[in-house]
């Protein structure tokens, strides 16, 4: 019948009822043989004696030399098949064999699942020699027991390189429940159903799973483990766990936020870091992304100018880098600037506005009324020309640029030359005679150099040729240049 | 061997409070549940409802949503019953008795001596 | 709530003889898993109650084999083969299938 021997009074046996070769304990020692603690090697020799071949599980002994009399059969005695005993606890079992001592080198192994148990186990090997046989106590002890130590044990004789296997003896250790699945976080849609689980094992088996809520309980009677735990929707916040049980007591799984995916919170800290004349550079802190990755965002631009017709400019941009850079502005210009990022939910308002201006632009038209002429007596070259009409936003005119490229045979060198704001004329040093010296002008301001007027061509003769008419370029503009010579 | 002690018998008067105690030893504390069971002189059992000893988390019977609390010491293994507001009809025997659900359903396996509350004025 | 109801209310018995307690429940204890969570408990004079049978006919530890428990769906027994002196007390039944766990109102085993 089974034996129990608990720690303490258990609301239901695991069998109902008696099962042979069982153990149910939580201080096992099957044996009251004298033992050395310690770390023992597992393998221990039997004095020397003849040997004898044997088949299966049992070595059957041949004839003797002297033919008088059959040997019995080898076996390991029977012995407790099934130990249950709590985690923590301590265990001793034992294989037990007795050998004629006409056997020499036996050894005695332990084997767990198949593989054998080497090194620092807790194997105790103890010979009782009498006139014929040796009693072979083989004991193994394993404090503090684990549910990595549950399994089925055997012990392995080898006589003369023949093996006789033990009954196995198998070993349930029983603990409290052990979560293999616990509910995870979550970002859900509110009012939308989803599922979380549970699951627990033993031994002892069966585990039952509870859900809470906020610290309410889901279900006052429980479910089976695996529990699948179907939440219809929620439209706030909630921690969930479980709890596991079974006869050894109960668990309690970690608790998980199950969040309400929302709209974004604005984002924040938009920063300016470069304006030019028609682009500004801005970044932005996101915002709470509202438990749904941004999507991405929307830069809005709006011009601040009593005469603007106040619309808005809207630039799509992806949620990552928390940058972007707005073109197609106007020089000179002042703009108020938000920043809103979207999830799968919605948009987010929009951040606090800011306040950026672009710089003065470079002018937009070149000057007008280019005329060059040849001064021969002075060797120089005039060239006038007329203010160009330039836009407020490409900001104050401080000065131009003179193109002049100088082309002969094999050779054509251009100079720039740089003149103030109040100038509308300028005279260059002929570079070289015998070419032809083409001239173009640009207006430059703060926010750089305009485009360049057309080029008028003027052609200098070698010395002692007298030529004194322009070239010009027609006021209106942009005409084909004209060279009078 | 485990064992549930509670604290002694109160004298109170209506419109009070009480706070019962169920100090557990030989187990471990916080791997249980603990069930409260009242007894009205001369009558039968009612199932208060429990509290998981790890994680607080109580569930009270209907009756005894209110002025019932379920707490713990998990330092000390005790488990507490605070009642307020006390009327007379809560003089009775209040037991703890260590509760979790096995592979035979809930389990009330071990029981506190009782603790006797009397509401008097 | 699952109403628990016992008879008889009083039970005098001569030591030695047999005794049988009923307890009907109005709903079935049977669970969805094929379980009946019916219960009996033992409360001696004086003393704290004690478990005695659970999912109606197992002993619990330490009860002696003259206890014995049947029944299914809402009609359940608890029988003592032969009456002994320890045995005086109040017997309940209690159910565990449905929330919240209810129980019978007491037969009390007195000897006569």
């Known amino acids: 019948a089974i034996t129990e021997a608990r720690e303490e009074a258990k609301p239901y046996p695991l069998f109902p009822g008696p099962l042979p070769g069982s153990l149910q304990t939580d201080h096992t020692s099957l044996l009251s043989l004298p033992h050395t603690s310690g770390y023992q090697p597992a393998l221990m020799f039997s004095p020397t004696q003849p040997g004898r071949p044997y088949t299966g599980n049992v070595a059957i002994p041949r004839v003797t030399s002297a033919g008088s009399k059959l040997l019995p059969p080898l076996a390991f005695k029977h012995t407790v098949g099934h130990i249950i005993l709590s985690e923590h606890k301590d265990v001793k079992f034992n294989c037990s064999i007795s050998v004629p001592n006409i056997y020499q080198d036996t050894t005695i192994s332990w084997w767990k699942d198949g593989k054998e148990l080497l090194g620092a186990h807790h194997a105790i090997t103890q010979f009782y020699p009498d006139d014929e046989v040796t009693a072979i106590i083989a004991s193994f002890s394993i404090t503090s027991v684990q549910r990595s130590d549950n399994g089925s044990y055997i012990c392995k004789m080898k006589i003369n390189n023949e093996e006789i296997v033990s009954d196995p003896i198998y070993i349930e250790v029983q603990g409290l429940p052990h979560f293999t699945k616990q509910p995870e976080s979550m970002n859900v849609t509110r009012n939308t159903a989803f599922n979380l689980t549970c699951q627990a094992v033993g031994p002892p088996e069966p585990v039952n799973i509870f859900w809470v809520q906020n610290s309410s309980r889901v279900n006052e009677q429980p479910e089976k483990s695996p529990s699948v735990l179907t939440v219809p929707g929620l439209t706030e916040m909630a921690v969930f766990s479980c709890e596991a049980h079974n006869d050894k007591g109960l668990t309690v799984s970690k608790g998980v936020q199950i969040n309400i995916k929302a709209i974004p919170s604005p984002p924040t800290e938009v920063s300016i870091h470069n304006s030019t004349a028609h682009s500004i550079l801005i970044s932005w802190v996101p915002g709470f992304d509202g438990y749904s990755p941004f999507r991405n965002c929307s830069v809005q631009v709006k011009e601040v100018d009593p005469l603007s017709n106040g619309s808005v400019m809207i630039f799509n941009t992806s949620a990552s880098p928390h940058m972007y850079q707005i073109k197609q502005l106007q020089a000179l210009a002042n703009y108020s600037i938000g920043v809103s990022c979207m999830n799968e939910i919605g948009w987010s308002a929009v951040s606090p506005w800011i306040l950026a201006s672009t710089t003065e632009g470079a002018p937009s038209v070149a000057p007008l009324n280019v005329t060059v002429f040849l001064n021969e007596s002075r060797d120089n070259v005039d060239i006038r020309w007329m203010k160009p009409l330039t836009k407020r936003q490409a900001g104050e005119l401080v000065g131009y640029r003179i193109s002049h490229v100088w082309q002969s045979a094999g050779i054509s060198k251009e100079l720039l030359e740089e003149v103030g704001q109040n100038n509308s004329r300028a005279q260059i040093s002929v570079q070289v005679h015998n070419a032809t010296c083409t001239v173009r002008i640009a207006a430059v301001t703060k926010g750089g150099v305009g485009p360049f007027s057309d080029p008028v061509k003027i052609f200098i003769p070698a010395h002692g040729w007298v030529d004194h008419a322009p070239s010009s370029t027609p006021a209106p503009g942009n005409a084909d240049p004209v060279l009078i010579i | 061997q485990v064992q549930l002690v509670q604290s002694g018998s109160e004298l109170k008067k209506p419109g009070a409070s009480v706070k019962v105690s169920c100090k557990a030893s030989g187990n471990t504390f916080t791997t249980y549940g603990m069930s409260w069971v009242r007894q009205a002189p001369g009558q039968g059992l009612e199932w208060m409802g429990w509290?998981?000893?790890?994680?607080?988390?109580?569930t009270y019977a209907d009756d005894f949503k209110g002025r019932f609390v379920f707490s713990l010491d998990t330092s000390v293994s005790t488990a507490y019953l605070q009642i307020s507001s006390l009327k007379a009809e809560d003089t009775a025997v209040y037991y703890c008795a260590r509760d979790y659900y096995g592979s035979g359903g809930w389990v009330f396996d071990y029981w506190g001596q009782g603790t006797t509350v009397t509401v008097s004025s | 709530d699952v109403v628990m109801t016992q008879s008889p209310l009083s039970l005098p018995v001569t030591l030695g003889q047999p005794a049988s307690i009923s307890c009907k429940s109005s709903?079935?204890?049977?669970?969805?898993?094929?379980?009946?969570?019916l219960n009996w408990l033992q409360q001696r004079p004086g003393q704290s109650p004690r478990r005695l049978m659970y999912l109606v006919s197992k002993l619990d530890s330490g009860v002696p084999d003259r206890f014995s428990g049947s029944g299914s769906g809402t009609d359940f027994t608890l029988k003592i083969s032969r009456v002994e002196a320890e045995d005086v007390g109040v017997y309940y039944c209690w159910q565990g299938t449905h929330f919240p766990r209810t129980f019978g109102g007491g037969t009390k085993v007195e000897i006569k």
């Open positions: 709903q079935s204890l049977l669970d969805s898993e094929g379980k009946t969570y």
């Open positions: 509290i998981n000893n790890y994680s607080g988390v109580s």
